[in-house]
């Protein structure tokens, strides 16, 4: 019996009945065994077929078989109801081998020419399966010459049987207080040969509750408990299960914060699996009762571990833990069923006793000593000598705990000294130097420090003076002895003030003329204003209208008198303003250098002389009455003049203060 070609020889060829194309003889039996490479099959078809026809091909036949299975028994020329001829059919081996047997019996009624067939090896497409047959691969099948291989979708791994896809379903940890988990692919059939482990791990103090929902379908057995596929639930206390079948298991209250769910499947079956909805509970905390004038948020039926609430106070009430203020309050429920902090109080906001107002007072409007939310107080300044700046003095205790003005200011109002008050009224005619009376020049300041000089009080802690008068002390401000509130130069009864800093105009050059002869002294403490100590006003923009030529100004000081000595008593003189050109001309002749009188100066005095300020008066104020406000203001600062005070044809020269208002304001606001 010819074996036919065997792999690895090329597998293709021709088979024919003995004597073909002639008739075949009786009592012939011929067998061919064809073998293809692994992963290949054999294909066979007939180009000629002419055998004796007999019932069930009992006489002459060609039999095709593959392994133990007979693929076909062929005879005749064309198929009948009970016999089969190959016709144009192609036959395929089931594996890689094909057996062909030709047999003729002892006689033929007429001559038959037999058969001719061709064969070849071809690749098996293992991925193609007949309807109703199990697929070659669980997920993806990939054919190639001589074989195939399987692969899996994401989330699966190929089992060692190389065909089944096992789910990668272990290591999932659920940490939320509730959630859902299910068998892989639920509600579609779960994968075979898989072992799934799910963990629920909550914070200590929580207890996990498991509810099986929707449907439950895990392969079972009528007699043995879950031998194929099963679901098990394990806690640190006990094990639940195994579960299988089609009945939803009952709720499981685990009384544990950690749960492990194991699901194991075998290689067969087609079941939809399971779905679990889990929740958690914990020991509830006492229900939080809001303090009076406060409310709890959020409002819940119960509060368990990790739940929290906050307390919010009504407007005008504040959170207090004892005496200590809190901006916010949140308490968290702990595992032992207690809150992590005690309930605060919502106490009415108390702004506390209002601060004392320097040179002023405060009055309780709502009631004596009432300082709580919405209480009203009224600040006022000491009459006559102080006035309230910008503010109406009415303050309300607001919800933020601050006394707040009607303009929303939280700072105290300011009692500013009233400026320019004097006991003296101007007479309108010029008369000789006279002794000042108490309250005539309450802004007058005596400056001692090397030489005698003067100044004028501004506000309650600044002194305006001439730069040349304090130049030597500019780096040693504390050396200046500043006295006020007295008429007598040598009197022991005066108000003492000390300098904190001296500010000399940056345009002033010592010993090189008197341009910009102006300075400010900052006092280290505020002085108390009274009838004998009152600041002078600075000139308003409109002040020039009271300082025209021939308008009367008043100079005061303890400077040299006609007798050539410093005055013991404060003296003053009323003098007219001199035309600027006239004054400039008076100081253009020798010994005065050209340009001595600048636009920053004004001149005052009599052409005939006799009325003038003199050495020792330097830095003092030349003041004018503002007839609109009825207040005195400083128009000039005693600066320089002729060597002989009160000389005819010469005039006293004063620093023109109105030119320096921005400089004064800048220094005072900056320091």
């Amino acid at each position: 019996t010819p074996l036919g070609p065997k792999w690895p020889e090329p597998v293709f060829g021709r088979l024919a009945s003995p004597g073909f194309p002639g008739e075949y003889a009786n009592d012939q039996e011929r067998r061919w065994t064809l073998t293809a490479p692994p992963g290949y099959r054999l294909r066979l078809y007939f180009t000629h077929f002419d055998l004796e026809l007999s019932h069930l091909c009992e006489y002459d036949f060609v039999k095709l078989s593959s392994g133990a299975k007979v693929l076909a028994t062929l005879c005749g020329q064309e198929s009948t109801d009970t016999e089969r001829a190959p016709g144009k059919d192609t036959f395929y081996s089931l594996g890689s081998s094909l057996d062909i047997t030709f047999r003729s019996d002892y006689s033929n009624e007429k001559p038959f020419t037999g058969f001719e067939a061709f064969y070849a090896a071809e690749d098996i497409d293992e991925c193609q399966v007949a309807p109703g047959e199990a697929p070659t691969c669980d997920h993806h099948c990939h054919n190639h010459l001589g074989g195939f291989y399987c692969s899996c979708r994401a989330g699966y791994v190929l089992h060692r049987n190389k065909r089944t896809c096992s789910a990668l379903c272990s290591g999932q940890v659920f940490t939320q207080r509730s959630g859902e988990l299910s068998s892989p692919e639920y509600p579609r059939p779960y994968p075979k040969l898989s072992s799934c482990t799910y963990s629920i791990s909550l914070e200590e103090g929580f207890s996990v509750i498991l509810d099986f929902v929707e449907s439950f379908d895990v392969e079972t057995h009528p007699e043995t408990l879950c031998p194929y596929d099963f679901l098990k639930i394990q806690t640190d206390r006990e094990e639940h299960g195994p579960f299988c079948g089609k009945t939803l298991p009952h709720r499981i209250e685990t009384k544990s914060n950690t749960v492990t769910i194991t699901f194991v499947t075998d290689e067969s079956g087609d079941h939809t699996g399971w779905k679990i909805h889990y929740t958690s509970t914990a020991q509830p905390c006492p229900y939080p009762m809001a303090p009076p004038n406060g409310h709890v948020s959020p409002v819940q039926a119960k509060y368990i571990l990790k739940d929290s609430f906050s307390i919010f106070c009504e407007t005008g009430y504040e959170l207090l833990q004892g005496h200590l203020p809190l901006k916010s309050f949140t308490a968290v429920c702990q595992k032992d069923g207690s809150w992590d902090r005690p309930m605060p109080a919502c106490s009415i906001v108390d702004c506390g006793p209002p601060d004392d107002l320097p040179s002023g007072r405060v009055e309780y409007i709502t009631g004596p000593g009432v300082t709580t939310y919405k209480a009203v107080i009224q600040y006022s300044c000491e009459e006559t000598f102080y006035t309230m700046k910008v503010n109406d003095g009415k303050y309300v205790c607001e919800a933020d705990g601050f006394w707040t003005s009607s303009k929303g200011e939280k700072s105290l109002p300011v009692c500013e000294p009233v400026c320019g008050l004097s006991a003296r009224t101007t007479g309108g005619r010029i008369y000789g130097g006279q002794k000042a009376k108490p309250g005539d020049f309450p802004w007058q300041v005596l400056i001692l420090g090397g030489t005698t000089a003067a100044g004028a009080l501004l506000y309650d802690n600044w002194v305006l003076t001439a730069a040349h008068a304090v130049y030597e002390q500019k780096h040693d401000a504390s050396a200046l002895d500043i006295r006020m509130g007295t008429l007598k130069r040598l009197s022991p009864h005066y108000t003492q003030a000390w300098s904190e800093a001296v500010f000399i105009h940056e345009g002033y050059t010592h010993d090189a003329g008197f341009d910009n002869d102006i300075a400010l002294i900052k006092l280290n403490n505020k002085v108390v204003i009274n009838s004998n100590i009152t600041p002078i006003c600075l000139p308003r923009k409109e002040a020039e209208s009271f300082m025209r030529t021939d308008d009367i100004g008043t100079a005061s000081g303890w400077g040299l008198t006609q007798r050539g000595f410093l005055a013991r008593n404060l003296m003053y003189v009323d003098i007219p303003i001199v035309d600027h050109q006239k004054c400039t001309a008076a100081y253009e002749k020798p010994p005065y250098p050209r340009g001595s009188v600048t636009a920053n100066m004004l001149c005052a005095g009599l052409e005939s002389g006799g009325k003038d300020s003199c050495r020792g008066d330097s830095g003092g104020a030349l003041v004018f009455l503002d007839s609109e406000t009825e207040r005195w203001f400083v128009g000039g600062i005693v600066s320089w003049g002729s060597m002989n005070c009160g000389e005819a044809g010469q005039y006293g020269v004063y620093t023109k203060v109105i030119n320096y208002i921005p400089w004064i304001e800048n220094i005072i606001s900056d320091f």
Epitope: Q321, H323, L324, P325, L326, K327, S328, G401, F402
Partner: antibody, heavy 114, light 107 residues
Framework: QVQLQESGPGLVKPSQTLSLTCTVS?????????WNWIRQPPGKGLEWIGY???????SYNPSLKSRVTISRDTSKNQFSLKLSSVTAADTAVYYC???????WGQGTLVTVSS | DIQMTQSPSSLSASVGDRVTITCKAS??????VAWFQQKPGKAPKPLIY???YRYSGVPSRFSGSGSGTDFTLTISSLQPEDFATYFC?????????FGGGTKVEIK
């Protein structure tokens, strides 16, 4: 991590003003709580000086109220203590603390001596 | 001002002992009392607030109780690191005040 750190001169002359600053890191002083100054004379107990709250309100021990000022600089996350007209009795370790007292500075010794 | 009177002012105990320190307020302070531990040259360390609430990180051997005027700090089993001075403190009423301290020494 909330941290408080006191700073300032360790020696102050009598009648002068004691000035200390507490620098806070890890928490904004305007977010919440009361920010306190507490002192402890050598070998003695603790004395509360006062606080400035998250909103800037102050509260002082009445025994020191006339001499004490607590202020803050929110841009630097600092609060400060000024105690005027000091005497030898003000010699102490000065602590800053956040209340509920959960965070304290390490303290700074201030000696009042000429 | 509210006086916080601590007793005893000092005590000697051994490792493993149960130690109780009491603090009496001169008037009702609710539960607004704190306890501090202080070691030489160190800042006070907070232990208890609101009479019975432990600060985080404080060992469970420390416990506080009381309300109104009578308060107690208990150390259930004294450890070597617990030898220190303990202060009570009321923050219920202005001005805030402290107890005079209790020194716990090794017997």
């Amino acid at each position: 991590q909330v941290q408080l750190q006191e700073s300032g001169p360790g020696l102050v002359k009598p009648s002068q003003t004691l000035s200390l600053t507490c620098t806070v890191s890890g928490y904004s002083i305007t977010s919440d709580y009361a920010w306190n100054w507490i002192r402890q004379p050598p070998g003695k107990g603790l004395e509360w000086i006062g606080y400035i709250s998250y909103s800037g309100r102050t509260s002082y021990n009445p025994s020191l109220k006339s001499r004490v000022t607590i202020s803050r600089d929110t841009s630097k996350n600092q609060f400060s203590l000024k105690l005027s007209s000091v005497t030898a009795a003000d010699t102490a370790v000065y602590y800053c603390a956040r209340y509920w007292g959960d965070y304290w500075g390490q303290g700074t010794l201030v000696t009042v001596s000429s | 001002d509210i006086q916080m009177t601590q007793s005893p002012s000092s005590l000697s105990a051994s490792v493993g002992d149960r130690v109780t320190i009491t603090c009496k307020a001169s008037q009702n302070v609710g539960s607004n009392v704190a306890w501090f531990q202080q070691k030489p040259g160190k800042a006070p360390k907070p232990l208890i607030y609101s009479a019975s609430y432990r600060y985080s990180g404080v060992p469970s051997r420390f416990s506080g109780s009381g309300s109104g005027t009578d308060f107690t700090l208990t150390i259930s089993s004294l450890q070597p690191e617990d030898f220190a001075t303990y202060f009570c403190h009321q923050y219920n009423t202005y001005p805030l005040t402290f107890g005079g301290g209790t020194k716990v020494e090794i017997k």
